[in-house]
């Protein structure tokens, strides 16, 4: 066969679907690889072909579109399963071609099982809610295109294993789940089960997402440098190890980049001709506020190093701060035999 632009196996789109539920999978060519859509391709006389490789097999084979009740079908650039079976797991390829053009991409599809409490190996999307912020909503995800707008599905929401009804601050509102006010206790997995009819059959769509309650922007403050501070003096003798921690608290801020860095005499440590190492550790609170610690270390400090200015800097979307460490050279204790004896008039 003639050459085909092969985009390979698109592992970025690790598609997971539940067993015994409908699944609609769009050919990724039009979403991520080509600059035109399916309608344009179809109008230009290009044909979309689907095939697959079963799990643990090397052989590519055509997809059987003649199964009972059209269990697998194709509609425009969408591959439909009504419903999926466990052994549909494999790598699927969609190929767009005519006599002069060919482009294809493969993607993995995994059909997973769930238990009665919706536990499964499915990777769950995370939705962040602000703590004590006011009404916030989550929406049942990825259900568009499964049924026409004329069909009115029934939607049931669960937290973990429990159906959500008569919860204090969580109210199901169709496709939305409203949190009147979110608390840490609202952390957990929430599942919507969408039930709809189609051609005399009833289908279920199960969608689970993880809710994580995070710090509210209303309480967010600029970075706070806890260390270095005015109460601690780093007093060292030449040859000793100098260790200065820079500990910074960052309020949680959605999509904010938190940065901590040291300067020595106004320059980045890399630009100073001394042997400095910097080690960073990060910890998070329950609401994802962040504490970053960068420890500046000079193994064998010199008297020159002890005269330098060591400044810790921090930046977030709320502002930038800096604090200087107080570094001094330790004055050696007087040696009794010489200094003190002389002081007492000894001869």
């Amino acid at each position: 066969s003639e050459r085909c632009d092969d985009w390979g196996l698109d592992t970025m789109r690790q598609i997971q679907v539940f067993e015994d539920e409908p699944a609609r999978i769009k050919c990724p060519l039009f979403e991520h690889f080509l600059k035109f859509n399916y309608s344009t391709a179809h109008s230009a006389g290009l044909t979309l072909i689907w095939y697959w490789t079963r799990q643990d097999r090397d052989l590519e084979e055509p997809i059987n579109f003649r199964l009972p009740e059209n269990r697998i079908s194709k509609e425009k650039d969408v591959l439909w399963f009504r419903p999926t079976l466990l052994n549909d797991t494999g790598n699927y390829t969609c190929m767009l071609r005519n006599t002069t053009y060919c482009s294809k991409v493969a993607f993995p599809l995994e059909v997973v099982q769930k238990d009665s409490c919706f536990n499964s190996p499915m990777k769950l999307p995370v939705h962040k809610l602000y703590i004590e912020y006011g009404i916030q909503r989550i929406t049942c995800p990825n259900v568009d295109g499964y049924f026409p707008s004329s069909v009115k599905p029934t939607i049931t929401w669960y937290m973990g294993c429990y159906k959500i009804q008569n919860f204090n601050n969580v109210i199901p509102e169709g496709m939305n789940l409203s949190f009147l006010i979110a608390f840490i206790s609202n952390n957990g997995n929430y599942t919507c089960v969408v039930t709809y009819p189609e051609n005399g059959r009833t289908f279920h769509l199960t969608r689970t997402l993880t809710v994580k309650v995070v710090g509210s922007p209303k309480n967010a403050v600029p970075p706070v440098i806890h260390s270095p501070n005015d109460h601690v003096v780093y007093e060292k003798e030449p040859g000793e190890e100098l260790l200065i921690p820079c500990t910074v608290y960052f309020s949680f801020l959605m999509d904010s980049r938190n940065e901590v860095w040291w300067t020595i005499d106004g320059k980045k440590p890399d630009d100073i001709p001394i042997d400095v190492t910097i080690n960073e550790s990060i910890s998070h609170s329950r609401t994802e506020d962040e504490t970053r610690t960068q420890i500046l270390s000079i193994k064998k400090v010199t008297s020159e190093d002890l005269k330098r200015s060591y400044v810790c800097h921090a930046r977030s979307a709320k502002g930038e701060v800096a604090k200087a460490a107080t570094v001094k050279q330790k004055v050696p204790a007087p040696r009794y035999t010489v200094e003190l004896a002389c002081g007492f008039g000894a001869t």
Partner: antibody, heavy 118, light 112 residues
């Protein structure tokens, strides 16, 4: 440049209504509180209340609760301070300022002088 | 309400000399996240107030390093290491621990 621009000076009679404004620019208006502060002639600063323009969550000082209304229109990046019925004792300079959560009123408006006199 | 008490209320200073203003709150301003919700503001004659220090000890952007804030809990201090003529005005502390924020009465700093 981050700035808050307040509406101009007002001279009113007792019993009249008034709404003064504070327009933010150069930053995300819905990501900071806007606070209002009163300064009566020759006196210190008094905190009146704050609003979060993102959802209009408003908190008042007990001294000003029921006396004034704080509101915001995020579509025009503007906060407002309103009186239904002014009194002579409302004569003051009113400042708006942006703030992070519970701290740092780091940008202030130029102040609006309100004079209430019969 | 948290009550903020400043002292002194008037502070005559000599340029080049240090100066110190105290602020005491009626309850601790130490937040559970380890910072103190106390700010210092300066209002120069005829101007809007300006932020000097926030969260107890953090200098605001553009504030000269002769200004420093210290303290924790209920007792706080604003220090000016060497007073300059442009530092005259009214200094206020403000607490932001609760959503009812409150200012101190103000300290008037003037040149002797």
């Amino acid at each position: 440049e981050v700035q808050l621009v307040q509406s101009g000076a007002e001279v009113k009679k007792p019993g009249e209504s008034l709404k003064i404004s504070c327009k933010g620019s150069g930053y995300s208006f819905t990501s900071y509180w806007i606070g209002w502060v009163r300064q009566m002639p020759g006196k210190g600063l008094e905190w009146m209340g704050i609003i979060w323009p993102g959802d209009s969550d408003t908190r008042y000082s007990p001294s000003f609760q029921g006396q004034v209304t704080i509101s915001a229109d995020k579509s025009v990046n503007t906060a407002y301070l309103q009186w239904i019925s002014l009194k002579a004792s409302d004569t003051a300079i009113y400042y708006c300022a942006r703030s992070s959560g519970g701290t740092a009123m780091d940008v202030w408006g130029q102040g609006t002088t309100v004079t209430v006199s019969s | 309400d948290i009550v903020m008490t400043q002292s002194p209320l008037s502070l005559p200073v000599t340029p080049g000399e240090p100066a110190s203003i105290s602020c005491r709150s009626s309850q601790s301003l130490l937040h559970s996240n380890g910072y103190n919700t106390l700010d210092w503001y300066l209002q120069k004659p005829g101007q809007s107030p300006q932020l000097l220090i926030y969260l107890g000890s953090n200098r605001a952007s553009g504030v000269p390093d002769r200004f420093s804030g210290s303290g924790s809990g209920t007792d706080f201090t604003l220090k000016i290491s060497r007073v300059e003529a442009e530092d005259v005005g009214l200094y206020y502390c403000m607490q932001g621990l609760q959503t009812q924020w409150t200012f101190g009465q103000g300290t008037r700093v003037e040149i002797k």
